[in-house]
């Protein structure tokens, strides 16, 4: 089938990095500068993506593959193939229509992107708050209040040291 197809269509012989040039009797011509073809049999080469402005070049364009972009520091990629760069915020903030805003009390964000999330409600699991939450960190839940009855301790005491020469009882 391949041989039949190549007899019918000389363009199918053109490899990636070339295009089938109708102006030159359908011979395979190399892609011009700043263009590429990632598959064989192409009748045109695609224009290389340019990583401009907030976008920076992660991988240069070649005759067989497009350029790849990522974002300059202070921004992160969004969308397929990094089609957008979104502003980073600080930990303890979220991005709103008016820019980066501090997380409201009772919420936190430990990343430079995404939204502020509510602190864990320890009591839902029957636990108590061991470490309070902040804008940047979730609360840390500890043992349940029942485990902390008078005389009980949340920290396991160390095993008593054995005296040399004594076997365990």
């Amino acid at each position: 089938f391949e041989r039949t197809r190549s007899l019918q269509d000389p363009c199918s012989n053109c490899p990636a990095g070339t295009f089938c040039d109708n102006n030159r009797n359908q011979i395979c011509s190399p892609c011009p500068p700043n263009s590429f073809s990632s598959a064989g049999g192409q009748r045109t080469c695609d224009i290389c993506r340019q990583c401009k402005g907030v976008f920076r070049t992660r991988k240069e364009c070649s005759s067989t593959s497009n350029a790849e972009c990522d974002c300059t520091p202070g921004f992160h990629c969004l969308g397929a193939g990094c089609s957008m760069c979104e502003q980073d915020c600080k930990q303890g903030q979220e991005l709103t229509k008016k820019g980066c805003k501090d997380c409201c009390f009772g919420t936190f964000n430990d990343q430079k992107r995404g939204i502020c999330r509510p602190w864990t409600n320890c009591s839902l699991d029957g636990k108590s708050v061991l470490v309070n939450g902040t804008k940047e960190r979730d609360v840390v839940c500890g043992p349940s209040p029942a485990d902390l009855s008078p005389g009980a301790s949340s920290v396991t005491p160390p095993a008593p040291a054995r005296e040399p020469g004594h076997s365990p009882q």
Epitope: R49, K52, F55, F75, C82, M84, Q87, G99
Partner: nanobody, 121 residues
């Protein structure tokens, strides 16, 4: 066609001031934010300041707070970056871009070519 043209770059002494302009043409200027970025020799490009279509400012770089301000004149399709108390570390090529929103840039946004600012005694 769409164009963004920066101007106003110069050699200035430390402590001096400069006003850069970003003049736009070929698109509905009022609908777009304008962001300023800079690239110093051998360093990563960094965001400086942005002004939204409604006139609100977003600082990308903490190092310019209190020294740089941004404004826009929609009648002249121009955004201005006013830079005061300039430091040698402000030396860079400054370029402007036109996103829809200061917090999000798209790969098909418009960009200028840049203007050189050199701070040196």
């Amino acid at each position: 066609q769409v164009q963004l043209q920066e101007s106003g770059g110069a050699l200035v002494q430390p402590g001096g001031s400069l006003r850069l302009s970003c003049a736009a043409s070929g698109f509905t200027f009022d609908d777009y934010a304008i962001g300023w970025f800079r690239q110093a020799p051998g360093k990563e490009r960094e965001g400086v300041l942005c002004i939204s279509s409604s006139g609100g400012s977003t600082y990308y770089a903490d190092s310019v707070k209190g020294r740089f301000t941004i404004s826009r004149d929609n009648a002249k399709n121009t955004v201005y970056l006013q830079m005061t108390n300039l430091k040698p570390e402000d030396t860079a090529v400054y370029l402007c871009g036109a996103p829809r929103d200061c917090s999000r840039y798209s790969s098909d946004d418009y960009w200028g070519q840049g203007t050189q600012v050199t701070v040196s005694s």
